[in-house]
Interface confidence: low
């Protein structure tokens, strides 16, 4: 079928269009083009006779048309009037007519649009703005862009006038943006330059910075005011309602208590005509006095006296704070604070309560500390200690004993021998001693302030012969692989050599054995069951020697992994099952059995008579050593076969 295709269909003014013919019949006489949807001689554009190749213009010929041998028609320099239908009339050689109609549309090339506005300075929350895209153009589509994005959906945005007008109702400062309009038709699209909407707003409620409202006398006051506003706000300051200055910042140096009051910042927008104010209350505090501590007892006695520390001066409506050793007060039943925190009472003072103590007065801006106070706690004397610790001496040596007892004030010392006063010194010295110097040596310490006395007695033996030593232990039942044991050879004697034997042999070399304290102490680290031996210590000097009785170390160990005997696991039905469990352990462990997880008896031997296949299963022996706190277990599978079905063993 004969058809006409317009290329392009939408044509811009001044361009050209080709009316292309498809399915042109064979054996043609000629063809003719007409403007419109039908053949009308008055509207003929051009005719063409194939035989003569002669083109004949018609009444509608404009001089811009070119006809091609394939019947296609090119129209150049298109004008608006060219829009419409075009009909091709084909006359075949048999003079049978055929017609086809095509069409195209002509659109103008659009000019660059511009935006007009009905309000160049709208006021926020009050005005509406109508943007209109110019010029008005027929058959054009209008589009709008905000910050190069398509329009958001909003009840405050309205398009009208064929989308040519964009109205923003109740403008806000957020509408301050770049607006563009665009015109489109099928042959062109043009975008306008940006129009920036200048929304007048504010001033908002101003903010005063900094936020702090409390100052000390003598500081500088520097307040700054800011309010969101377009155009920028003009600022005024008022103090207690009295105008001060028209600046954004207010500066008052070296303030006093008299500068306390209400400070108002007023922001004014001359374009919107609006004023907004913000008030802040400034309080200026005078410097408080430095506090100090008084005490009701300057020399309290340990465990007897209480001490009340008071923070001075007394000031109404003030918070008092306390520190001990530069830390806040610990929680203690011996520390009591009065209702106003001004008095700190130490009940039944101890020597550890010396301090230092500080109190503080808190005001709105800071805390003022007192100087530290240290308590002079009277204590002691504690039980004196006599050194050195030797109790055996050889004749002919010098005896020099020293006594010390913790005490405040320092203790006064006295020495007694067999109850007889000797001297009032801290040290006792006797040269070239003999057996007659053996006896009870007493040191007496006296605290003159508290009136308390304490004594310690030491037995001194002067003898050429050494006594029989003995072994003391710090752990009588050590646990294997866990504990250490320290054996000490007693007594401590001057100019004496200490020796050790294990099972009658001298000490083996071992990283687990360590001698210390002049060989007087033997330490066994990480004891094992093999350390359960006889230990003997000996002492000797140039005159005599002696050995202790043996001490046997009782090492607690185990339980080790138990062994179930006999080892058999297959039995014939009807046999007796007699299982015995053993585990190395000190002390002996407690035994218990489980069959298929079910607890049985607490015995070392499990006996079941005349077993059947029902006795198949897992037999578990559990061992527990209460002394070491350790447990162990083993599981054995037992299979019982019906008689004659397997050559199993019989118990």
């Amino acid at each position: 079928k004969l058809t006409i295709e317009s290329t392009p269909f939408n044509v811009a003014e001044g361009k050209e269009v080709l009316l292309l013919v498809h399915n042109l019949p064979q054996h043609l006489f000629g063809y003719s083009w007409y403007k419109g949807e039908r053949v009308d001689g008055n509207r003929q554009i051009i005719g063409y006779v194939i035989g003569t190749q002669q083109a004949t213009p018609g009444p509608a010929y404009s001089g811009r048309e070119i006809i091609y041998p394939n019947a296609s028609l090119l129209i150049q320099n298109i004008i608006q009037n060219d829009t419409g239908f075009y009909t091709l009339h084909v006359i075949k050689s048999d003079l049978v007519n055929e017609e086809a109609t095509g069409q195209f549309r002509v659109y103008p090339e659009l000019p660059k649009p511009s935006i007009s506005s009905n309000n160049s300075k709208p006021v926020e929350d009050k005005d509406a703005v109508a943007f209109t895209c110019e010029p008005e153009t027929q058959d054009a589509t209008y589009l709008w862009w905000v910050n190069n994005q398509s329009l958001p959906v909003s009840p405050r945005l309205q398009l009208s006038n064929g989308n040519r007008t964009l109205t923003l109702f109740n403008v806000t400062r957020n509408d301050t943006a770049s607006y563009k309009c665009e015109t489109q038709n099928p042959v062109s699209a043009r975008r306008s330059d940006s129009v920036i909407l200048n929304v007048l707003y504010g001033p908002d409620a101003p903010t005063i910075s900094p936020l702090n409202t409390s100052y000390r006398s003598g500081e500088n006051l520097n307040l700054s005011c800011h309010a969101a506003s377009n155009p920028p706000a003009q600022y005024s300051w008022f103090v207690n309602g009295t105008f001060q200055q028209s600046t954004q910042e207010l500066f008052i140096p070296n303030i006093t208590v008299n500068n306390s009051g209400s400070y108002t910042c007023q922001a004014h927008n001359s374009d919107t005509g609006l004023n907004r104010t913000t008030v802040t209350t400034i309080t200026v505090y005078a410097e408080p006095p430095k506090p100090f501590i008084t005490s009701n007892n300057s020399n309290p006695v340990e465990d007897e006296d209480a001490v009340a520390l008071t923070c001075e001066p007394e000031i109404q409506n003030t918070t008092y704070l306390w520190w001990v050793n530069n830390q806040s007060l610990p929680v203690s039943p011996r520390l009591q604070l009065s209702n106003d925190n001004r008095t700190l009472t130490l009940l039944s003072v101890t020597r550890n309560d010396v301090g230092p103590y500080e109190c503080g007065i808190q005001n709105e801006l800071s805390v003022d500390h007192s100087d530290p106070v240290i308590l002079n706690v009277l204590y002691g004397p504690d039980d004196p200690t006599i050194s050195p610790s030797y109790t055996y001496y050889r004749p002919g040596v010098n005896l020099s004993l020293s006594c010390h007892a913790a005490s405040n004030p320092p203790a006064q010392y006295s020495w007694l021998i067999d109850g007889n006063i000797q001297q009032h010194t801290q040290e006792l010295f006797i040269s070239n001693i003999t057996e007659k110097n053996s006896g009870l040596y007493t040191c007496q310490a006296n605290n003159s302030a508290s009136g308390h006395s304490r004594t310690t007695v030491k037995t001194i033996t002067v003898s050429a012969e050494l006594p029989k030593p003995s072994i003391s232990s710090n752990n009588s039942k050590p646990v294997e692989d866990k504990d250490a044991v320290a054996f000490t050879c007693e007594p401590e004697a001057q100019n004496t050599t200490y020796l050790w034997w294990v099972n009658g042999q001298s000490l083996p070399v071992s990283p687990r054995l360590q001698l210390s304290n002049g060989n007087r102490t033997l330490t066994l680290f990480n004891v094992t069951r093999n350390d359960a031996r006889a230990y003997v210590c000996g002492i000797q000097n140039s005159v005599s020697a002696n050995r202790s009785d043996p001490v046997t170390l009782d090492v607690l160990y185990g339980p080790d992994t138990p062994i179930i005997s006999p080892p058999d696991s297959s039995y014939l039905s009807g046999a007796n099952l007699n299982l015995s469990c053993h585990s190395a352990s000190n002390p002996s462990p407690q035994y218990s059995w489980r069959i298929n997880g079910i607890p049985q008896q607490h015995t070392q031997v499990l006996f079941i008579a005349k077993i059947t296949p029902n006795n198949n299963g897992t037999y578990a022996c559990f061992v527990s050593n209460l002394a070491t706190g350790r447990n162990n277990s083993i599981v054995k599978s037992i299979t019982v076969s019906a008689s004659g079905t397997s050559p199993g063993l019989s118990a």
């Epitope: 589009l143 398509s150 958001p152 959906v153 009840p155 405050r156």
Partner: antibody, heavy 121, light 111 residues
Framework: EVQLVESGGGLVQPGGSLRLSCAAS????????MHWVRQAPGKGLEWVGR????????KYADSVKGRFTISADTSKNTAYLQMNSLRAEDTAVYYC??????????????WGQGTTVTVSS | EIVLTQSPATLSLSPGERATLSCRAG??????????LHWYQQKPGQAPRLLIY???NRATGIPARFSGSGSGTDFTLTISSLEPEDFAVYYC?????????FGQGTKLEIK
């Protein structure tokens, strides 16, 4: 700061009624649409409906149309969801969310903590 | 009613990997060329949290590893490098026309 607090949830028998509240602060509900969204246990989110508090116009999901009514009290800055003829399938956590240019830029940027509605006999 | 289909239903990944979640609309959700499709994250016992609005805009306080793209009917949420706190359920929602609809959700779980 924008805040939404839903309340009024609880246990109700099938056929019963319940009224949920959504108290808003930090913005004016007149400037937005107020939506209700629900989430059944272990399921996804389902839009229930919305109201324009400025004029009272409301829209609903087909599943609740005729049974649920959304209203708003602009003086209290609060939206409500009146639920009648409740069914077991209405069991869910119910959320409210504002939607509009001023508050949430045309998405649900703010949600309440949700209130649980259980419909069971 | 515009139907939103999310895929996959479950996504198993490890921290540090890239996650790509898809949301397909039964018809275009564009208005003036802008996709009115949003992405939300929800963790157990919590309300949904807006991640991406109108296709590609990150909501306030959302880390830069979250991004959205797409227009018309096909939209994608991408998490460039997964953090432990990103494992949750993600929903898409269209607000182009009533009724506003949500996708059925994609569960992002730790592999």
């Amino acid at each position: 700061e924008v805040q939404l607090v839903e309340s009024g949830g609880g246990l109700v028998q099938p056929g019963g009624s319940l009224r949920l509240s959504c108290a808003a602060s930090g913005f004016n509900i007149k400037d937005t649409y107020m939506h209700w969204v629900r989430q059944a246990p272990g399921k996804g989110l389902e839009w229930v409906g919305r109201i324009d508090p400025a004029n009272g116009n409301s829209k609903y999901a087909d599943s609740v149309k005729g049974r649920f009514t959304i209203s708003a009290d602009t003086s209290k800055n609060t939206a409500y969801l009146q639920m009648n003829s409740l069914r077991a399938e209405d069991t869910a956590v119910y959320y409210c969310a504002p939607f509009g240019y001023y508050v949430s830029d045309y998405a649900m940027a703010y949600w309440g903590q949700g209130t649980t509605v259980t419909v069971s006999s | 009613e515009i139907v939103l289909t999310q895929s996959p239903a479950t996504l198993s990944l490890s921290p540090g990997e890239r996650a790509t979640l898809s949301c397909r609309a039964g018809e275009s959700v564009d208005i003036f060329g802008v996709g009115f499709l949003h992405w939300y994250q929800q963790k157990p016992g919590q309300a949904p949290r807006l991640l991406i609005y109108r296709g590609s805009n990150r909501a306030t306080g959302i880390p830069a590893r979250f991004s959205g793209s797409g227009s018309g009917t096909d939209f994608t949420l991408t998490i460039s490098s997964l953090e432990p706190e990103d494992f949750a359920v993600y929903y898409c929602q269209q607000t182009n026309e009533d009724p506003y609809t949500f996708g059925q959700g994609t569960k992002l779980e730790i592999k």
